[in-house]
Interface confidence: medium
Amino acid sequence: CKAMHVAQPAVVLASSRGIASFVCEYASPGKATEVRVTVLRQADSQVTEVCAATYMMGNELTFLDDSICTGTSSGNQVNLTIQGLRAMDTGLYICKVELMYPPPYYLGIGNGTQIYVIDPEPCPDSDF
């Protein structure tokens, strides 16, 4: 297993609809045909997997249909979008990239993107 640098933004603010997007960029040392991207969430020293997808160079990034993540890939960049976020989902979201094939296997883990989610205020009742 060889190390690889992964860069991602330090902070992202989710939209009022609970959607957060960020770019995960990796420094590919070789010409990989298969790349696996995993998003991990770290909160209160607990790490959980949010979503994962594998893609082939020249093809699009596809998450499973029931995933809260969507994304696109372009070269060594992956544009990730996480949906359905609520205030309780605020935390550090870490991008993990694996170059699966061909050998050697490379692994890179970003420093994480702190995603802040603010639940929208409920609309006040209006009397007409």
Partner: nanobody
Framework: QVQLQESGGGLVQAGGSLRLSCAAS????????MAWYRQAPGKQRELVAG???????NYVDSVKGRFTISRDNAKNMVYLLMNSLKPEDTAVYYC?????????WGQGTQVTVSS
């Protein structure tokens, strides 16, 4: 875990055609990509063609216009139709399944193209 079984390989004359099939079983719900790789004697295994769960395909330049990959999700199958075969297409062809937590290979099927 996912298991893959290829079939359809054989001996064919240059200019001929073959259709390879790959049957997937096991945790197939977690597969987003299916692909065919090939490995010629003394060479590294190379990606030939891939198809994702939405049906988007990609091909290595050397087979574009000659090979067609397709996927039947209902039958958990992936196919590789190979037309206008050349001697340099001779190799063991491997089926590949990829997903968030899946990376499986088939056992391979031999394709030999004689001139």
């Amino acid at each position: 875990q996912v298991q893959l079984q290829e079939s359809g390989g054989g001996l064919v004359q240059a200019g001929g055609s073959l259709r390879l099939s790959c049957a997937a079983s096991g945790s197939i719900f977690s597969i987003n990509h299916m692909a065919w790789y090939r490995q010629a004697p003394g060479k590294q295994r190379e990606l030939v063609a891939g198809v994702n769960s939405r049906g988007t395909t990609n091909y290595v330049d050397s087979v574009k216009g000659r090979f067609t990959i397709s996927r039947d999700n209902a039958k958990n199958m992936v196919y590789l139709l190979m037309n206008s075969l050349k001697p340099e297409d001779t190799a063991v062809y491997y089926c590949r399944a990829l997903g968030g937590a899946v990376a499986a290979w088939g056992q391979g099927t031999q394709v030999t193209v004689s001139s």
